[in-house]
């Protein structure tokens, strides 16, 4: 699997989207966790509804959600007032049984905020409000790992 | 011109808490920008620990997430440095700076060392 | 973490010389915005780093235009075209484009 890199900014909600084969995976439940480390285990942040029908409710644990929209075949991610600590390796899963098929891994990237100061100048997005108020935006950059790129790079 | 200068007990016992105020002149910290602490170990290397913005939002350093405080007094224009349960490790000179987000850290206390031993 | 890797650690020169210092980032520095907050700071024995370069290649204030930064992406330089006494010290990159945000480990600028 390749990784695809979502870009999201300090304290503002960031989308992942999982698109997969709505027929291969019909009736599966999805998850979303974190890899933790390299070869590590891959720690369960959230799951869809315990019904598989009901899987386009949204389902929270703590800031994150998931919701999928299985006859489009999309696993939606919702990461709210995104932090450092949300930086890192996720994985997108398909659930049957106790197994877990991978449909996306994931790289977090947590940005600096451009609205910590109001004399931003050219922090600002371009075409996007510059009032306080409307810049809860959902962000949602993503792009494949490039090659070079570390998704865990060695601790200094 | 704005100024900031650390202050706050050069030693700390293990397991304590370090406490250090910076102190603002010549500008607001509620006006704008992020008020940041930094601090460099022995040997030179810097650690960014966290900031509190103007409008008092808080990020910090997932490394010290559960240790780390930063608070302010706006009447009085400081902002303050907590950081529990220290350990030999924690021996450093800590600095404030204000980050702006297109010059970085362009202005600096002139650091305070703080000597975590029993 | 981004991690900040400088090279080299300690670079001896003598007074006149050009001296080059090299960053490189474990990820792109480049923001959604389009901007790479890529710094550079001197920190001389015994005081506070002081900013010199910012976003890859604007001098601050009051910097000397023998200071020069350039770069892109994860692949950075400072360039001093000649040395002179006041600029020994340590020179640190730094990047503010991560919410986490990190340093190089410092390069020491000393005579030959």
């Known amino acids: 699997h390749n990784t695809t890199v979502f870009q999201g900014v300090a304290g503002q909600s960031l989308q992942v989207s999982c698109p997969y084969d709505s027929m291969k995976h019909w009736g599966r439940r999805k998850a979303w966790c974190r890899q933790l480390g390299e070869k590590g285990p891959c720690q369960r942040v959230v799951s869809t509804h315990n019904l598989w029908l009901l899987s386009f409710l949204r389902r929270w644990n703590g800031s994150t959600a998931i919701t999928d929209d299985t006859l489009g075949g999309t696993l939606t991610i919702t990461l709210r007032n995104l932090q450092p600590h949300d930086a890192g390796l996720y994985q997108c899963q398909s659930l049957h049984g106790s197994e877990a098929d991978t449909l996306r891994k994931v790289l977090v990237e947590v940005l600096a905020d451009p609205l910590d100061h109001r004399d931003a100048g050219d922090l600002w997005f371009p075409g996007e409000s510059e009032s306080f108020e409307d810049a809860h935006v959902e962000h949602s950059i993503s792009r494949s790992l490039l090659e070079g790129e570390i998704p865990f790079p060695p601790t200094s | 011109d704005v100024q900031l200068q650390e202050s706050g007990p050069g030693l700390v016992k293990p397991s304590q808490s370090l406490s250090l105020t910076c102190t603002v002149t010549?500008?607001?910290?509620?006006?704008?920008?992020?008020w940041n602490w930094i601090r460099q170990f022995p040997g030179n290397k810097l650690e960014w620990m966290g900031y509190i913005n103007y409008s008092g939002r808080t990020i910090y350093n997932p490394s010290l997430k559960s240790r780390i405080s930063i608070t302010r007094d706006t009447s009085k224009n400081h902002f303050f440095l907590q950081l529990i349960s220290v350990t030999t490790e924690d021996t450093a000179t800590y600095y404030c700076?204000?980050?702006?987000?297109?010059?970085?850290?362009?202005?600096w206390g002139q650091g305070t060392l703080v000597t975590v031993s029993a | 973490d981004v991690v900040m890797t400088q090279n080299p650690l300690s670079l001896p020169v003598s007074l006149g010389d050009q001296a080059s210092i090299s960053c490189r980032s474990s990820q792109s520095l480049v923001h959604i915005n389009g901007n790479t907050y890529l710094h550079w700071y001197l920190q001389k024995p015994g005081q506070s780093p002081k900013l010199l370069i910012y976003?890859?290649?604007n001098r601050f204030s009051g910097v000397p235009d023998r200071f020069s930064g350039s770069g892109s992406g994860t692949d950075f330089t400072l360039k001093i075209s000649r040395v002179e006494a006041e600029d020994l010290g340590v020179y640190f990159c730094?990047?503010?484009?991560?919410?986490?945000?990190?340093f190089g480990s410092g390069t020491k600028l000393e005579i030959k």
């Open positions: 976003k890859v290649s």
């Open positions: 700076a204000r980050w702006n987000g297109n010059y970085g850290f362009a202005y």
């Open positions: 010549g500008y607001s910290i509620t006006s704008d920008y992020a």
């Open positions: 730094s990047q503010t484009t991560h919410a986490l945000f990190t």
